[in-house]
């Protein structure tokens, strides 16, 4: 049940007052305001928007609003030397060139500073060679090519379709396979919904549309030149050769019209199966090289982008807590966009703006939250979560001691079908209870709760009558808070009915066609889905900041720990002989999970019964809840990924967007049958079980009675 705590205020200032103040019309107005020109990280336009937001948040009534700047490594195309890809004939003449820019959408023909499509942080280079089509360039796609089809990508330029996994993982896989260049393209099979027109007549990707994006493999490092520390005025910067996560081969994205011209000439091996075929009218031959008449033609990349240390600006707003000002609930989302940012990020930034306005309205009427709320407009998220990570690095000591929760607020919509939530298990009950109190915006669910429509449209695979809540992965600004610092985190947005394309994004993602009109005409004309997302995000922040007892249920962590232990055990049991040979046992992990379950249950009983009027005991119980997420942090981090320190969850090593449970054990077991030294490999599995079991047991003990 929602709290109605009075902190020197009249009782009307409760969650309902906060939610009733949120208005769809305001979100619409803010979205329009934020999307009229590009706001690329590191540009003057994005600095001006930061100052505008600072000014407006002050007007809305926050106690303080400051800009926090950092000088980080960014990447831009060369304005006078454009990037493109050619088909060259035997004489080296360019007989076909890919497009240099996306045809601008109607009404935006005269907008300046639209950055052409590029892969941020691609090195410069002009490699030429035969093409190999590598499907999605996933780990399993390269296994299929190299192991089953015996196709060698060494010295080849690979072409991969966007989708399924984070583009940085594709590039890393291509590098490891020996490729000398990567072409990324959007196949209509992944970015064109059947029966929908392409923009501007619908929300599908036109043939000239291209997805921008960074291709880093930062593994949580933040600025590539200052891993672990803020990129401030006195920072020591690594040389570019030692920078974290930079790709070593040229990479460039193209649209499907250009991809058609490259793929239609492909020869060599036929695709291994239908899962390698997209929707273009091409054979999807793997190669290497072109067929018959075109066998003497090659592909050449021309990449001239530059990496530059550039100033970025976060906006940090504070609404001081009345009772526990040293406890921070953070609502953050990014402000920088690739072009207009109609969905990513401004549909989220507009919601944050309205949430700030609502909180400000309550504050002006004399209300304060129990705990401090921090609002953040992050910069340079698109360049590797840089703004949020640098700020968290700068404030890590405060955050690890005072951070209660982080709620992320990037794109509010990626569809208009149902709610999508990814969060720590500690927040499951908060999300369930909140969505039961909110009205569903969905057609056919008038008068029904959001919980009901969400559960109907996206049911939990495990528990009937409950909605699906996913694991946190990465690819957004919660990463440093959750994966590095162990602060309970969550995110919510409206999504599509398109489970198979979970990690491919919506069709116009990161293209020039992601405009205000896209949202207003096709996704959410009434802005009712935006309002619902504002209510969910804002409601979570309100409850986290204002409830007397933190709305965390540690028993839900116990349930998932058992599920994750079962899952990793079953993966290991695919190798029964080796488990026997190397004496691999999961007993310690299951024992720790059992202990956690029992201790969490007893803690929950005490939580019901303790004297909430005793501020010392209240603070003690809340601290145990707040620090539970922190207890899953291993200070040494995961193998080769020192900034991923959460033992229960990490971004998948094969897809940054996806969350993996017990990632240390999972990675140790992955492809273990191919390891050259099985004894060493199984030894690492045993070590990871030990780390996981210890961590779960240690976390359980933080919930025990203190004395």
């Amino acid at each position: 049940k929602s709290s109605n705590e009075a902190t020197n205020i009249t009782p009307k200032h409760n969650m309902k007052a906060f939610l009733d103040e949120l208005k769809a019309e305001n979100i619409k107005k803010f979205l329009y305001n934020f999307t009229q020109i590009p706001h690329l990280a590191g540009t003057e336009q994005n600095f001006q928007l930061a100052k505008q937001i600072q000014s407006q948040w002050k007007e809305f009534g926050l106690d303080s609003v400051e800009l926090a700047h950092y000088d980080v490594l960014l990447s831009y195309p060369n304005k006078t030397h454009p990037n493109y890809i050619s088909i060259i004939n035997e004489d080296g003449n360019e007989i076909f060139n890919t497009s240099l820019f996306e045809p601008p959408p109607p009404g935006y023909e005269n907008v300046s500073d639209i950055v052409p499509p590029f892969s941020a942080f691609s090195p410069q280079g002009m490699p030429e060679g035969d093409l190999v089509y590598v499907n999605y360039a996933r780990t399993e796609d390269f296994f299929k090519l190299e192991r089953d089809m015996k196709i060698n990508c060494s010295g080849k330029i690979v072409i991969a379709r966007y989708g399924k996994v984070f583009r940085g993982n594709k590039v890393k896989n291509a590098q490891l396979a020996g490729a000398k260049g990567v072409i990324l393209y959007s196949d209509p099979a992944d970015y064109f919904a059947p029966g929908v027109k392409s923009y501007p007549d619908g929300w599908n990707l036109p043939g000239g549309g291209v997805q921008r994006g960074n291709i880093l493999n930062l593994n949580g490092a933040g600025d590539p030149l200052t891993p672990g520390y803020p990129a401030n005025e006195y920072a020591y910067r690594r040389g570019i050769a030692e920078a974290v996560g930079l790709p070593s081969i040229p990479v460039h994205p193209i649209g499907y019209y250009d991809a058609q011209k490259l793929l239609e000439k492909m020869g060599g091996s036929a695709p291994p199966d239908s899962s390698w075929r997209g929707s273009l009218k091409v054979p999807y031959n793997v190669g290497p090289g072109f067929t018959g008449n075109f066998s003497t033609q090659k592909v050449k990349m021309h990449i001239h982008s530059t990496n530059e240390v550039t100033r970025i600006y976060n906006v940090i707003g504070t609404l001081r807590g009345a009772v526990e000002p040293d406890r921070y609930v953070i609502l953050g989302g990014h402000r920088d966009s690739w072009v207009f940012g109609g969905i990513d990020p401004q549909s989220g930034a507009a919601v944050v703006h309205e949430i700030v306005r609502s909180f400000g309205t309550l504050k002006k009427e004399g209300w304060r939250p129990r705990r401090t709320i921090l609002f953040a407009s992050w910069d340079a998220e698109e360049f590797g979560l840089l703004g949020s990570t640098e700020w968290a690095e700068e404030n890590s000591r405060l955050l690890q001691e005072r951070g209660v929760a982080y709620i992320n607020a990037d794109s509010s919509i990626e569809g208009n079908y149902t709610l999508r939530v990814d969060c720590t298990p500690l927040m499951y009950s908060l999300v369930h209870n909140l969505t039961k109190e909110l009205k569903s915006p969905d057609e056919g669910f008038e008068g029904k709760s959001l919980y009901e429509s969400w559960t109907k449209k996206s049911p939990s695979p495990e528990f009937s009558g409950m909605p699906r809540i996913s694991k946190l992965g990465s690819g957004n600004d919660f990463e440093v808070f959750f994966q590095r610092l162990g602060i309970a985190s969550g995110r919510a947005r409206y999504t599509k009915n398109w489970e198979t394309n979970k990690f491919s994004g919506y069709p116009l993602y990161h293209s020039v066609y992601e405009t205000y009109e896209l949202v207003e005409k096709f996704y959410d004309p009434m802005f009712k889905y935006h309002l619902t997302v504002a209510q969910v995000r804002g409601g979570m922040v309100f409850e986290l900041a204002n409830s007397i007892v933190l709305p965390f249920d540690c028993r839900d962590y116990a349930v998932v720990l058992r599920k994750y232990a079962d899952k990793i055990y079953s993966i290991s049991m695919k190798h029964p002989q080796e488990m026997k040979t190397y004496s691999v046992s999961f007993d310690s992990l299951f024992s720790a999970v059992k202990n956690f379950t029992e201790i969490a249950s007893k803690f929950s009983e005490r939580l019901q019964d303790f004297d909430k009027s005793n501020p010392i005991v209240l603070r003690m119980m809340n601290d145990q809840l707040m620090f539970l997420e922190r207890a899953f942090i291993d200070p040494l981090g995961l193998p080769d990924r020192p900034f991923y320190r959460h033992v229960i969850y990490a971004p998948s090593s094969h897809n940054k967007y996806a969350g993996e449970s017990f990632p240390g054990i999972y990675d140790a077991l992955f492809d273990i049958e191919s390891k050259v030294d099985p004894s060493k490999a199984w030894g690492e599995v045993k070590r990871q079980i030990y780390v996981a079991a210890f961590t779960v047991q240690a976390a359980a003990e933080t919930l025990s009675e203190v004395a």
């Epitope: 007989i95 076909f96 060139n97 497009s99 043939g207 000239g208 929707s279 273009l280 009218k281 091409v282």
Partner: antibody, heavy 120, light 112 residues
């Protein structure tokens, strides 16, 4: 809007050549192949071949190979089709048509047609 | 070459009544990506052909919903639910799965 404007009617003697033009507007010329299709009362619609304006790659119907040449000028978004060694049965209406690319892969826009008469 | 055979070649229809045209191909028109590139064109008297239906059953933009396409493999049908006066003309099926692209002989729709 997409438009294909063809050159005017031609009268040719047998054995001569004819070169027809097709000027495209309203879209990015290099993205879409241009097909040439002819129509006669006897044979109906007959696909002669196509050209990719982006790289100049051509694909000819075997029935016309050796007699047909397709070219393009990207600077003025114009495709050309030359048919040589004309015979009386080449008398037809010749259409250029844009190959619609994904999702159509059909001829989604046609020129107005050029009548070619081959007569001694 | 793929031979496209239409029937009937002439189709007299009463206004407001349905009409159906059949098209058969000499080989399967399923492309390796699973799509079937069978299209229907309409040619009104004195005009160029225009695309009506693409990939068996998808209406091209601006085409009234009384036109529908169906079929698979080698057998395809174009249906007009209620014929209107403006529908008079010749209807061609065509395939672009195999090179050379080929057309049916055409079906002349006229009003009774």
């Amino acid at each position: 809007q997409v438009q294909l404007v063809q050159s005017g009617a031609e009268v040719k003697k047998p054995g001569a050549s004819v070169k027809l033009s097709c000027k495209a507007s309203g879209y990015t010329f290099t993205y879409f192949d241009i097909n040439w299709v002819r129509q006669t009362p006897e044979q109906g619609l007959e696909w002669m071949g196509g050209i990719s304006p982006g790289d100049g790659n051509t694909n000819y119907n075997e029935n016309f190979k050796g007699r047909v040449t397709m070219t393009r000028d990207t600077s003025n978004s114009t495709a050309y089709m030359e048919l040589s060694r004309l015979r009386s049965d080449d008398t037809a209406v010749y259409y250029c048509a844009r190959d619609g690319n994904f999702p159509y892969y059909a001829m989604d826009s046609w020129g107005q047609g050029t009548t070619v008469t081959v007569s001694s | 070459d793929v031979v496209m055979t239409q029937s009937p070649l002439s189709l007299p229809v009463t206004l407001g009544e349905p009409a159906s045209i059949s098209c058969r191909s000499s080989q399967s028109l399923v492309y390796s990506n699973g799509n079937t590139y069978l299209h229907w064109y309409q040619q009104k008297p004195g005009q160029s052909p225009r695309l009506l239906i693409y990939k068996v059953s998808n209406r091209f933009s601006g085409v009234p919903d009384r036109f529908s396409g169906s079929g698979s493999g080698t057998d395809f049908t174009l249906k007009i639910s209620r014929v209107e006066a403006e529908d008079v003309g010749v209807y061609f099926c065509s395939q672009s799965t195999h090179v050379p692209y080929t057309f049916g002989q055409g079906t002349k729709l006229e009003i009774k």
